[in-house]
């Protein structure tokens, strides 16, 4: 399976909410021995491999923001902790999963990564990730609402086996 990032860049004004999105593509094993671990974290550019560094989002680690379920099931993060930080991650039945960030500030600008780990019990695990950039802007050059820029077809499907 692959992870697609429909948008590679989100440009938002301060104070706005944004939902960053990834999509699980390809054949997904829905067997009882397979579960999916999905999460989000921040990273930085200029590494040998994008998304290799895992940094927290608003002080929440990738463990705090994870979703754990089978196949294309819907799920949400534990509300209390995330919502206190203005965050919510969610997943639907169609392989889409997202993180919503409320009341953006300039400090939220940066590179965001979604991670999917397919865990086969008693077997190996398969990891893929997607990357996207969030630019929070203020002043005259801010947009009135979030503007999203599609990934090039080459960029939109990141395959990174662990």
């Amino acid at each position: 399976f692959k992870v697609a990032t429909p948008y590679s860049l989100y440009v938002c004004p301060e104070g706005q909410n944004v939902t960053l999105t990834c999509r699980l593509l390809g054949p997904v094993d829905k067997g009882h021995d397979v579960t999916f671990y999905k999460t989000w974290y921040r990273s930085s550019r200029g590494e040998v491999q994008t998304c290799s560094e895992r940094r927290p989002i608003r002080n929440l680690t990738f463990q705090d923001l994870h979703l754990h379920h089978g196949g294309h099931q819907a799920a949400n993060t534990s509300h209390d902790l995330a919502q206190r930080h203005g965050l919510e991650s969610a997943s639907d039945h169609h392989g889409n999963f997202s993180i919503t960030m409320r009341n953006l500030t300039l400090l939220d600008s940066g590179l965001y990564c979604c991670l999917v780990v397919e865990i086969r019990h008693h077997h190996s695990e398969h990891r893929v990730h997607g990357a996207m950039e969030l630019q929070v802007q203020t002043g005259k050059d801010a947009p009135s609402n979030c503007v999203v820029y599609p990934s090039s077809s080459q960029d939109s499907e990141n395959i990174t086996a662990a």
Epitope: K140, P143, S144, N145, V147, Y149
Partner: antibody, heavy 119, light 105 residues
Framework: EVKVEESGGGLVQPGGSMKLSCAAS????????MDWVHQSPEKGLEWVAE??????????YYVESVEGRFTISRDDSKSSVFLQVNSLRPEDTGIYYC??????????WGQGTLVTVSA | DIVLTQSPAIMSASLGEEITLTCSAS?????MHWYQQKSGTSPKVLIY???NLASGVPSRFSGSGSGTFYSLTISSVEAGDAAAYYC????????FGGGTKLEIK
């Protein structure tokens, strides 16, 4: 249906003042970022001023040539935006359009109001 | 400020012809927007964010480009397309091109 309608233009002498008004409907006005755009044969289309929503502290921005002479304001209770134009110059002559900004472009435009600055 | 230069200033086209209007920026911009202004009316957005067709705009219109060079293409010109076309960018400071006037032969 989104509607934007300007009024208040007319003939004014150099150095004079007037207040342009814009009434909007068909969208949540209090959330909108509203702009004025000027059009003249000499300058073409030129952005003039912007006022942002209450969530953005009604921040205002101006093109350099009108800074200190023009003032943009809004009344969310009346879904209206205003442009107070003072110390008018002949080069301010033209049509003034009220627009609503979406992202980085002007999504909706009024029919415009003509301002003529002449002795 | 970023200066947008449109060419040609005036263009004449036959019905059914495919035409391309261009807009060149003095510095690289992330996006370009295009407006159509028919005689005696206000501008109307045609294309936003370089490629996106505004609501109600026929699919004969399309936009493309990146960096400093952008274009608007009309795949099959119709009589109702006679108008002035303006490009627009909003970097740290919004500017418009001088326009291309399209005349129908």
């Amino acid at each position: 249906e989104v509607k934007v309608e300007e009024s208040g233009g007319g003939l004014v002498q150099p150095g004079g003042s007037m207040k342009l008004s814009c009434a909007a409907s068909g969208f949540t006005f209090s959330d909108a970022w509203m702009d004025w755009v000027h059009q003249s044969p000499e300058k073409g289309l030129e952005w003039v001023a912007e006022i942002r929503s209450k969530a953005n502290n009604h921040a205002t921005y101006y093109v350099e040539s009108v800074e200190g002479r023009f003032t943009i304001s809004r009344d969310d209770s009346k879904s209206s935006v205003f442009l107070q134009v003072n110390s008018l110059r002949p080069e301010d002559t033209g049509i003034y359009y009220c627009t609503r900004r979406d992202g980085y472009y002007f999504a909706y435009w009024g029919q415009g109001t003509l301002v003529t600055v002449s002795a | 400020d970023i200066v947008l230069t449109q060419s040609p200033a005036i263009m004449s086209a036959s019905l059914g012809e495919e035409i391309t209007l261009t807009c060149s920026a003095s510095s690289s911009v992330r996006d370009m927007h295009w407006y159509q202004q028919k005689s005696g009316t206000s501008p109307k957005v045609l294309i936003y964010n370089t490629f996106n067709l505004a609501s109600g705009v026929p699919s004969r219109f399309s936009g493309s480009g990146s960096g400093t060079f952008y274009s608007l293409t009309i795949s099959s010109v119709e009589a109702g397309d006679a108008a002035a076309y303006y490009c627009h960018q909003w970097s740290s400071y919004p500017t418009f091109g001088g326009g291309t006037k399209l005349e129908i032969k």
